[in-house]
């Protein structure tokens, strides 16, 4: 009998009520592997979740977060509110970065400014709550006749969470 069930492909289930015939998954359910005895209920993307990929008979729906929120956890199991650049999300809500720190993202915590002197460089552009300092050439390079340094590229684009 087990062999009969193993023949049931993804998108179907092995129906015990019908002599183990392979029946299609009912609406709003799916089976992503063959040989399943039941189909799983499709995930519904409601509230702060929005649908990224519709459910099919062989794969679950995939959710994203609505504007103003970002995903956390495997398969975007949670949506957490965004903050503004220059802020960090604490357990009590969004809070401005303290002096000496910045956040150029809408999520995460405030990061300490780069200490240019650790690499023997000088500060070319001061840091803000939203931007790191820009380091320039070392003070010795700034003597008369020394060529001016090209400033580094603008701040990086946001990355992605470890999902």
């Amino acid at each position: 009998l087990q062999d009969l069930c193993s023949n049931c492909p993804a998108g179907t289930f092995c129906d015990n009520n019908r002599s183990q015939i392979c029946s299609p998954c009912p609406p709003n359910s799916f089976s992503s592997a063959g040989g399943q005895r039941t189909c799983d209920i499709c995930r519904q993307c409601k509230g702060v979740f929005k649908t990224r990929k519709e459910c099919s008979s062989t794969s679950n729906a995939e959710c994203d977060c609505i504007s103003g929120y970002h995903c956390l956890g495997a398969e975007c199991s949670m949506c957490e509110q965004d903050c503004k650049q220059g802020q960090e999300l604490t357990k009590k809500g969004c809070k401005d970065c303290c002096f000496g720190t910045f956040n150029d993202q809408k999520r995460g915590i405030c990061r300490p400014w780069t200490n240019c002197s650790l690499d023997g460089k000088s500060v070319l552009v001061n840091g803000t709550k939203e931007r790191d300092v820009v380091c320039g050439p070392s003070p010795a390079d700034l003597s008369p006749g020394a060529s001016s340094a090209t400033p580094p590229a603008p701040a990086r684009e946001p990355g992605h969470s470890p999902q």
Epitope: R107, R111, P112, A153
Partner: antibody, heavy 120, light 110 residues
Framework: QVQLVQSGAEVKKPGASVKVSCKAS????????MHWVRQAPGQGLEWMGW????????NYAQKFQGRVTMTRDTSISTAYMELSRLRSDDTAVYYC?????????????WGQGTLVTVSS | SYVLTQPPSVSVAPGETARITCGGD??????VHWYQKKPDQAPVLVVY???YRPSGIPERISGSNSGNTATLTLSRVEAGDEADYYC????????????FGGGTQLIILG
């Protein structure tokens, strides 16, 4: 897929320097900070510092300031960690690890590690 | 600088639940990450930001964080879970932003 591939094992004498490389692939190298973490034999993980591959900006753990230099070559998507004035207690496996795109989350991808042995 | 304290080892029988703690002053106000480290392998992120699992990490691994203690919980423990586990936080202070706990060896009995 994201991969971080590190340079091979090194044996150094006390007082020498070592430079470990970490070549990134499968993502935009300049979009994600790179961190360096080490583990000495029988010891725990120890954070050493980070580099922003886009700007070259760095931050080093106080313990390593003055001895460590983190650099990058964006043309070959490679980060480097150089440790100078080596001592026997610098014998460790050195790892590069990628930050996931914002500060305050876990390090989601790691290199395979580079064993640095400091011995006279 | 900020200190994270972990027990050196935790022992548990297969199929039971293991709880590994990570203590720190007001750690509940921080975001805690947990890594699994096996011999001769790179660390693997198993929980981030207190309680979220990256893709591929089984649901029987979970995390919590409040007050002065964060906890990593492994239910229905298997032999393959035997490893060292490290908690970690980030600070906004510039002298030592990255801090790891001392690590806990999870020992599977029998």
């Amino acid at each position: 897929q994201v991969q971080l591939v590190q340079s091979g094992a090194e044996v150094k004498k006390p007082g020498a320097s070592v430079k470990v490389s970490c070549k990134a692939s499968g993502y935009s190298f300049t979009g994600y900070y790179m961190h360096w973490v080490r583990q000495a034999p029988g010891q725990g993980l120890e954070w050493m510092g980070w580099i922003n591959p886009n700007s070259g900006g760095t931050n080093y753990a106080q313990k390593f300031q003055g001895r460590v230099t983190m650099t990058r070559d964006t043309s070959i998507s490679t980060a480097y960690m150089e440790l100078s004035r080596l001592r026997s207690d610098d014998t460790a496996v050195y790892y590069c690890a990628r930050e996931p795109g914002y500060y305050g989350s876990g390090l989601d991808y790691w290199g395979q590690g580079t064993l640095v042995t400091v011995s006279s | 600088s900020y200190v994270l304290t972990q027990p050196p080892s935790v022992s548990v029988a297969p199929g039971e639940t293991a709880r590994i703690t990570c203590g720190g002053d007001d750690i509940g106000d921080k975001r805690v990450h947990w890594y699994q480290k096996k011999p001769d392998q790179a660390p693997v992120l198993v929980v981030y930001e207190d309680r979220y699992r990256p893709s591929g990490i089984p649901e029987r691994i979970s995390g919590s964080n409040s007050g002065n203690t964060a906890t990593l919980t492994l239910s229905r423990v298997e032999a393959g879970d035997e490893a060292d586990y490290y908690c970690q936080v980030w600070n906004s202070s510039s002298d030592h932003p990255g801090v790891f706990g001392g690590g806990t060896q999870l020992i599977i009995l029998g």
